[in-house]
């Protein structure tokens, strides 16, 4: 029951995560016009990975899109990179996990192949997960920089009498929908992982015990459970089931309702 | 077509109080930010106060801040400019304006004259 | 608060004559989000209200003749008149739309000899 609960939450996080890194992806604000110690502008900037928008008091929003490939700085290249990878790897990972859950069956899986999907799937979160992080961290690094460097000269402009001010960016919404959705679907990919652990089948499956009484040989073999002699090395009293035979956690489904928002 | 109709003239004394309403027609009222603008005596223009099409946003000038409310009812297509502490240099004639693209003002009221004077 | 200031206060001209008016304001008025110049130019004839000219400091309001020209960018703008008639006698003025408190200018009052 555990093994499924670990594997099914974690395939629900690990989707809800998912779909965060494909919301941050696409969103338009990564970086928003700072707005504290500035001059009231009536007119808000905010730039995505794919287009830099302005929102005007008027209400009329206009936004273009980064139709250059080679004239944008190497650094939004690499955070796009990370972020398309991130969504790529988890999409491959929901689709190997959602083959790989006990609840779900299919032919006549073995136990051992759903467990290697299970981990297959829980190190592609993983990474994704990592590879948003990544991407938002780079990001808000590059912003930062940028930030400061702005302070420096925030008034440029000719002996002082006319100035112009430079637009200051801070962090945008996106990175904060980009860091919180990599790490669930990281956390996702961990608690696969760990499912991954609990679906492996036993090594051995001991289905009889010899006992020898002196003088006499006498083989019990008690249905269903090893009897533990205290000698060797199988000192641990475990639950043996015949081959075809279905554990609680394979026959429980694991229903649960996700509105990502 | 595009209209807007601002209350009658007054005339108030210094301190007083006076609410200024500017009733909309011939478009989605709701879907534009609007603004009042005042005309001094002497021909000045003056931007008063900015409001946003969902009323969430609100700007003034700094001579009016504090004094001036700018709201507006989206269900009655009206919006409004309630003043108080009334001075002199209030003396001008108010218009109230649609902002279009570039903040700009498209549509402007025929303008109600205020006069304060003791 | 941004200061407008326009140049000259007055202007006498002949009807067909080319008119140039300038505009010039404290701090930039460029937009780097979308290289968009926030002012805009407005007519006032007598007894009316202000009507829209131009907005972006280029862009002409639909209705309006085309011999109304905005050009200009940063802190420098100019209005110009190709060929000035009768019912172009009007004071026109110039707006900062960028920085709150949006400002006017004194406005320049164009008069037809």
């Known amino acids: 029951m555990a093994v499924t609960a670990c594997q099914g939450l974690g395939f629900v996080v690990s989707l809800i995560g998912i779909a965060g890194i494909i919301a941050a992806t696409c969103m338009d604000q990564w970086s928003t016009q700072d707005l504290y110690n500035n001059p009231v502008t009536a007119v808000f900037n905010y730039q995505g990975l794919w287009r830099s928008c302005v929102r005007e008091s008027s209400g009329f929003t206009e936004c273009r899109g980064y139709f250059t490939l080679l004239g944008l700085p190497a650094m939004l290249q690499a955070v796009r990179a990370l972020m398309i990878v991130g969504i790529v790897l988890g999409a491959i990972g929901l689709l190997v996990s959602i083959f790989a859950l006990k609840c779900i069956r299919i032919g006549s899986m073995e136990d051992s192949a759903k467990a290697n999907m299970t981990l297959t799937s829980g190190i592609m979160f993983i990474v994704s997960g990592l590879c948003a992080i990544a991407g938002v961290s780079v990001f808000a690094n590059m912003l930062v920089t940028n930030f400061w460097m702005s302070t420096a000269n925030m008034y440029t402009g000719m002996g002082g009498m006319v100035q112009t001010v430079q637009t200051r960016y801070t962090f945008g919404a996106a990175l904060f929908v980009g860091w919180v959705a990599g790490g669930l679907t990281l956390i996702g990919g961990v608690m696969m992982c760990i499912a991954c652990r609990g679906l492996a089948p036993e090594e051995t499956n001991y289905k009889a015990v010899s006992y020898h009484a002196s003088g006499h040989s006498v083989a019990y073999k008690p249905g269903g459970f090893k009897a533990s002699t205290g000698f060797g090395s199988n000192t641990k009293n475990k639950k043996i089931y015949d081959g075809g035979a279905r554990t609680e956690d394979e026959v429980q489904s694991y229903p649960s309702k996700h509105d990502y928002v | 077509d595009v209209k807007l109709v601002e209350s009658g003239e007054d005339l108030v004394k210094p301190g007083g109080s006076l609410k200024l309403s500017c009733a909309a027609s011939?478009?989605?009222?709701?879907?534009?930010?609007m603004s009042w603008v005042r005309q001094t005596p002497e021909k000045r223009l003056e931007w008063v106060a900015y409001?946003?099409?969902?009323?969430?946003?609100?700007y003034y000038a700094d001579t009016v801040k504090g004094r001036f409310i700018i709201s507006r009812d989206n269900a009655r297509n009206t919006l409004y400019l309630q003043m108080n502490s009334l001075r002199s240099e209030d003396t001008a004639m108010y218009y109230c304006?649609?902002?279009?693209?570039?903040?700009?003002?498209?549509?402007w009221g025929q303008g109600t004259t205020l006069t304060v004077s003791s | 608060d941004i200061v407008m200031t326009q140049s000259p206060s007055s202007l006498t001209v002949t009807a067909g004559e080319k008119v140039t008016l300038s505009c010039k304001s404290s701090?930039?008025?460029?937009?780097?989000?979308?290289?968009?110049?926030?002012l805009t130019w407005y007519q006032q004839r007598p007894g009316q209200p202000p009507k829209l000219l131009i907005y972006?400091?280029?862009t002409r309001e639909s209705g309006v003749p085309d011999r109304f020209t905005g050009s200009g960018s940063g802190t420098d703008f100019t209005l110009i008149i190709s060929s000035v008639q009768a019912e172009d006698l009007a004071v026109y003025y110039c707006?900062?739309?960028?920085?709150?408190?949006?400002?006017f200018g004194g406005g320049t009052k164009l008069e037809i000899k």
């Open positions: 304006a649609r902002v279009y693209f570039g903040n700009s003002l498209d549509y």
């Open positions: 011939g478009f989605t009222f709701s879907n534009y930010a």
């Open positions: 409001v946003s099409s969902g009323g969430d946003y609100i």
């Open positions: 701090q930039s008025l460029l937009n780097g989000g979308n290289q968009k110049n926030y």
């Open positions: 972006w400091a280029s």
């Open positions: 707006q900062n739309d960028y920085y709150y408190p949006w400002t």
